[in-house]
Interface confidence: medium
């Protein structure tokens, strides 16, 4: 960052999107600012308009191509600059040499579905979205189940230390409404972080058969 009160954080979704957040203490809300991306190995550059997301932070998405196109590799360096208009000129507010595969945050898993549900267990599957083929199987997942009367924050995390796009939830209560979420993270990258949580999948366990213990 150009000065100590500025914070500029970006993540690559591993395919064709770099999402950035810039925060600056004391910056004017109505200032027009952009993120400029200049890859060192590519014959393109890209710009996105920073839009306010809070009192002192702005965000934008650099769309590098079609969602599943592989636009960057592990040896690309993208110089990212925050440029803000000052009168008729542009002033550089922040800069970073962005290494895409060191700063990964994948898209949230999609297509969650109940494969099979019983009284005490439920098998759920999902798919990863817009994830690079470079990862092969080097991904991990976290999942959580929302039980009645609890919050998501209270839900214990289940970790899948391999690329496993399904889970069998055990020891559930019969005839009970649950919600399920999953997120994904590549093993690669010093500053890589978890994807957002998936949209919750609601399901209900089957009622216990009459005359049987629960």
């Amino acid at each position: 960052a150009v000065n100590g009160t500025s914070r500029f954080t970006c993540f690559y979704n591993s395919r064709a999107n770099i999402s950035c957040v810039w925060s600056q203490d004391g910056a004017l809300q109505d200032t027009s600012c952009q993120v400029h991306a200049w890859p060192d190995r590519r014959r393109w550059n890209q710009t996105c308009e920073l839009l306010p997301v809070s009192q002192a932070s702005w965000a934008c998405n650099l769309i590098l191509g079609t969602p599943d196109s592989q636009k960057l590799t592990a040896v690309d360096i993208v110089t990212l600059r925050v440029m803000c208009r000052e009168g008729v000129r542009w002033r550089m507010m922040a800069i970073q040499d962005f290494k895409p595969f060191e700063n990964l945050r994948l898209m949230a898993p999609i297509s969650l579905q109940v494969v099979h549900v019983e009284t005490h267990r439920c098998n759920i599957s999902w798919k990863i979205s817009q994830a690079s083929h470079y990862f092969e199987r080097h991904l991990e997942f976290e999942a959580r189940t929302l039980s009645p009367g609890h919050t998501w924050e209270e839900a214990p995390l289940m970790t899948l230390k391999q690329k496993q796009e399904w889970i069998c939830l055990e020891t559930l209560t019969p005839d009970t409404q649950y919600e399920f979420q999953v997120r994904v993270k590549p093993l690669q990258g010093e500053f890589t972080t978890w994807s957002p949580w998936s949209q919750p999948l609601a399901f209900r366990t089957k009622p216990a058969a009459l005359g049987k213990d629960t």
Epitope: W38, P39, D40, R41, R42, R43, T73, A74, V75, I77, T79, L80, I95, Q96, D97
Partner: antibody
């Protein structure tokens, strides 16, 4: 016209230090990555590291910790600081810049400066 | 690190001959470059991105290949082509070069 001019080479004793300079003209060092490459006498080329346009650096593990790349934007000059020099560091040292995109390879080279490490 | 192995390490050919140099990578690479280095001079870029001719380079030079196997060709050797030729990968860091192929005139 893009030009790179290395200087600072010479004779240094083992264990000593030396700072090489690479004066750039025809472009701004804040807009392009610049690399250091060396060639031992009668040998092939070895990539040492680079400083990117935003100022961050990348090194070959073979020299990381002993060699440091830096730059002075106001002088449009790059530096290679070499410490704890060994006989095997004897080489011609080049700075190089890719074309407008690195896909274009090392399109621009300096003339090289000779470093001799010997007692 | 990716090892780049050139063959032959040296060759002698007559003016007008077709000369071929191969470069084998220890693992698959996507971006390959070829340089010419005359004695006492800095390297000069000839081929970028596997097969593209650098600015001002004569069309007798060409490159091809993919994956781990690449080829550099001089279609008709000229006296000024006496030099050492290097391949280089830019698919992963550290960047690495082949050991060089010295080309001489018979």
């Amino acid at each position: 016209e893009v030009q790179l001019l290395e200087s600072g080479g010479g004779l240094v004793q083992p264990g000593g230090s030396l700072r090489l300079s690479c004066a750039a003209s025809g472009f701004s060092v804040t807009s392009y990555g610049v690399h250091w490459i060396r060639q031992a006498p009668g040998k092939g080329l070895e990539w040492l590291g680079a400083i990117w346009s935003g100022g961050s650096t990348q090194y070959n593990a073979a020299v990381k910790g002993r060699f440091t790349i830096s730059r002075d934007n106001s002088k449009n000059t790059l530096y290679l600081q070499m410490n704890s020099l060994r006989a095997e560091d004897t080489a011609v040292y080049y700075c190089a810049r890719a074309g407008d995109y690195n896909y274009d390879g090392f399109a621009y080279w300096g003339q090289g400066t000779l470093v001799t490490v010997s007692s | 690190d990716i090892q780049m192995t050139q063959s032959p390490s040296s060759l002698s050919a007559s003016v007008g001959d077709r000369v071929t140099i191969t470069c084998q990578a220890s693992q698959s690479v996507s971006f390959l470059y070829w340089y010419q280095q005359r004695p006492g001079k800095a390297p000069r870029l000839l081929i970028y991105d596997t097969s593209n001719l650098a600015s001002g380079v004569p069309s007798r030079f060409s490159g091809s290949g993919s994956g781990t196997s690449y080829t550099f060709t001089i279609s008709s050797l000229q006296p000024e082509d006496i030099a050492t030729y290097y391949c280089q990968q830019w698919s992963t860091y550290p960047l690495t070069f082949g050991q060089g192929t010295k080309v001489e005139i018979k």
